[in-house]
Interface confidence: low
């Protein structure tokens, strides 16, 4: 069956060193446990996180994300997942694409992560 993939529709903001959460889901909602779900960086197609065959495929990740991502799957049976990126870096800023693949049918959604400096301040002088 066909579906749409829907991202947050607004930039996700996170502080350097903090966590970022990128939500993504299919509509209409359906069980995505058996689907392939992933995020890659746009436009470079570097794999940020990949879930396939019911498991996180850590070996597929780009080295700069290894050990820093977690796919929150509590609601995957409803077609909703969230990618958590830990210890956010300035280099994480930019475009991300989430995709769901059900056999040969794939749809995706773009989203943006904005990274901010918690110590940034404006000199009043």
């Amino acid at each position: 069956g066909q579906f749409r993939v829907i991202g947050p529709g607004y930039p996700i903001r996170a502080l350097v060193g903090d966590e970022a959460e990128l939500p993504c889901r299919i509509s209409p909602g359906k069980n995505a446990t058996g689907m392939e779900v992933g995020w890659y960086r746009s436009p470079f197609s570097r794999v940020v996180h990949l879930y396939r065959n019911g498991k996180d495929q850590d070996a597929e990740q780009a080295p700069e994300y290894r050990g820093r991502t977690e796919l929150l799957k509590e609601t995957i049976s409803e077609g909703k997942v969230t990618l958590r990126i830990q210890n956010v870096r300035f280099s994480d800023e930019g475009g991300y694409t989430c995709f769901f693949r059900d056999h040969s049918y794939q749809e995706e959604a773009a989203m943006e992560l904005k990274v901010e400096d918690p110590f940034y301040w404006v000199n009043p002088g």
């Epitope: 829907i6 529709g9 903090d18 889901r25 209409p28 958590r84």
Partner: antibody
């Protein structure tokens, strides 16, 4: 089954403070953003505030910004709304609502708790 | 802030009739629109999300349509328990998430 139970409402004088609590059960609380939505007597619904799963992101309606603070305790499966400098126009039933899996609709609601601000 | 306007304010119909409720956004909200039902003394209940998808457990007589600025909730054949207040809500431009003022569906 999913349950949300609000408490802490009551009668308070203008300028006063109140803390609302919402106890959640029947689902993995730490995986859901949570919201507060209010409804003045005989009026429509007004979104008040929300908080992300890890408490890093909190948003507020302009009408309560600087006066209300939302927080959560994932260990206690609870979300809170601390209200200061209360005004007559804050009088409403306050509902705690679960976010529909990160998509900013509200799929489960509590029964509400009435906050009355009056001198 | 996006303003949601519902019409009519009150709709008087009989059980078995078809109900059509409208919601208009002050600017495009794409398909990011939900419908809720609220009965007296109760909390709202999610009926439709993303303009046309029924929430879990919602009967097939409820359907939603529309995109952009104009949306419709249709109840194909009214049951006695359907008489209530209905609200639309957008999540396209947030915060805040804004609701319409409501349409009261009453028994004729």
């Amino acid at each position: 089954q999913v349950q949300l139970v609000e408490s802490g409402g009551g009668l308070v004088k203008p300028g006063g403070s109140l803390r609302l609590s919402c106890a959640a059960s029947g689902f993995t609380f730490s995986s859901y953003s949570m919201h507060w939505v209010r409804q003045a007597p005989g009026k429509g619904l007004e979104w008040v505030s929300d908080i992300s799963t890890n408490s890093r992101t909190r948003n507020y309606a302009d009408s309560v910004k600087g006066r209300f603070t939302i927080s959560r305790d994932n260990a206690k499966n609870s979300v809170y709304l601390q209200m200061h400098s209360l005004r007559d126009e804050d009088t409403a039933v306050y509902y705690c609502a679960r976010d529909y899996g990160g998509i900013y609709y509200f799929d489960y609601w509590g029964q509400g708790t009435l906050v009355t601000v009056s001198s | 802030e996006i303003v949601m306007t519902q019409s009519p304010a009150t709709l008087s119909l009989s059980p078995g009739e078809r109900a059509t409720l409208s919601c208009r956004a002050s600017q495009s909200v794409s398909s990011y629109l939900a419908w809720y039902q609220q009965k007296p003394g109760q909390a709202p209940r999610l009926l439709i999300y993303d303009a046309s998808n029924r929430a879990t457990g919602i009967p097939a007589r409820f359907s939603g349509s529309g995109s952009g600025t104009d949306f419709t909730l249709t109840i194909s054949s009214l049951e006695p328990e359907d008489f209530a207040v209905y609200y639309c809500q957008q999540r396209s431009n947030w915060p805040p998430y804004t609701f319409g003022q409501g349409t009261k569906l009453e028994i004729k």
